[in-house]
Amino acid sequence: EEELQVIQPDKSISVAAGESATLHCTVTSLIPVGPIQWFRGAGPGRELIYNQKEGHFPRVTTVSDLTKRNNMDFSIRISNITPADAGTYYCVKFRKGSPDHVEFKSGAGTELSVRAKPSAPVVSGPAARATPQHTVSFTCESHGFSPRDITLKWFKNGNELSDFQTNVDPAGDSVSYSIHSTAKVVLTREDVHSQVICEVAHVTLQGDPLRGTANLSETIRVPPTLEVTQQPVRAENQVNVTCQVRKFYPQRLQLTWLENGNVSRTETASTLTENKDGTYNWMSWLLVNVSAHRDDVKLTCQVEHDGQPAVSKSHDLKVSAHPKEQGSNTAPGPALASAAPL
């Protein structure tokens, strides 16, 4: 009689994570008597997956009834496949022996590859805010996918970015993989409403890529521009001085008026107007009682934005001139009033 052969018809199979994998194995003879065992891998480190005679293998079921006398089908089904199950599976016939069974013949092996979806990409930006014209780095990470082939793209407001570096780890064979990418983005003053998108495409996603986003509003700081103007008011001894704080982001802003270098008043921005580009404007004003001053007054509007060093603009208020004769287009400069703001 021809010697028993162990036939594993499938050289390889691919299964999605969470599904079941069926590993086929048949033998060509009932002789010699002895059990079948399934292993993953070869060599001394091979792992026992199923033993026909003993052991507890909760995820493994046999396709055929192995108790039937003439059974020659030793196929198994492994449930709830995970990337950790990837590898080559061998169906091995043992010859009955005493006290131990002896390995008789092995099948050629079936390579099981597991398709596992990447996790949702997580995009993170720099720890500290940056100002327009600066280049900032964003990172994108996704984990747990298999096979290794994956495509990652970066976009800013729908426009694809080209300045990025991507690594897939580990470099060698693994049950699953991770991707890590760093993109460089140049900020502009208009980026408060901008978004950076990391897009990951993988065979398991059926052409519907996963996306992770970061809002540049979390990253950008647009410093304000300051303009100080003065206008006469009805009362002949009063001048209204305004400090226009324009196009800043984020909202956090504190303004201090100084009169000849001395702090007159400090206020925190409250009622802001928002521009279309997402930046904010704010105006502070005060009434200066000209008759209370003998000499010219240097008024300074000092603004501390988002914890950054203060910026300021000064305005010289000429006391000698009659308020009504002073035009509204005098040199810009923050004014510090001794009177409360209107």
Partner: antibody, heavy 122, light 107 residues
Framework: EVQFQQSGTVLARPGTSVKMSCKAS????????MHWVKQGPGQGLQWIGA????????TYNQKFKGKAELTVVTSTSTAYMEVSSLTNEDSAVYYC???????????????WGQGTLVTVSA | DIQMTQSPSSLSASLGERVSLTCRAS??????LNWLQQEPDGTIKRLIY???SLDSGVPKRFSGSRSGSDYSLTISGLESEDFVDYYC?????????FGGGTKLEIN
Amino acid sequence: EVQFQQSGTVLARPGTSVKMSCKASGSTFTSYWMHWVKQGPGQGLQWIGAIYPVNNDTTYNQKFKGKAELTVVTSTSTAYMEVSSLTNEDSAVYYCTRSFYYSLDAAWFVYWGQGTLVTVSA
Amino acid sequence: DIQMTQSPSSLSASLGERVSLTCRASQDIGSRLNWLQQEPDGTIKRLIYATSSLDSGVPKRFSGSRSGSDYSLTISGLESEDFVDYYCLQYASSPFTFGGGTKLEIN
């Protein structure tokens, strides 16, 4: 009781070969992989390779491929290792040990031979 | 290959003291780590398998543990026969690799 009896001390000339043995007793020889480990003088341990007596399947540490050759004689439950083209670097104690026919934690390198000392000298 | 970095390479301690030896794996080896003891005459004995399982006949003062990629052998209450060499061994992936060893010396 499981025991490994290794062959005695060898003094060999550079360029020659030595073949040492490890005889197993107390269990089924064919249910285990037989491993060989090298320990140079005052040095640590290095895994050389292993052989499976059932089908003479071997696996080697790349560093020892072409240097060591593993064989078995199942009828006498004996594993052999031949070390060829001897140099001073091969002067060491060589140990045999075993692991189960699949990766069973409790069966990895439990039992060890007493070691064979090989001295290479002109 | 997986590198096993064992520390310290030598350690002086007193009788009754508690000591810990550590092996760091360069790649994931799960729990597939043994601790071996080598006597001055070359005799090798396994103390711990699968990171923390104590071999039969090994005194309970020996214990194994893991924290991430660091694997430790702790001997609580050193006795005179403990002052020998110790090695860790990973059997997760071929080629199987050993730590460089720790020589435990009496103070």
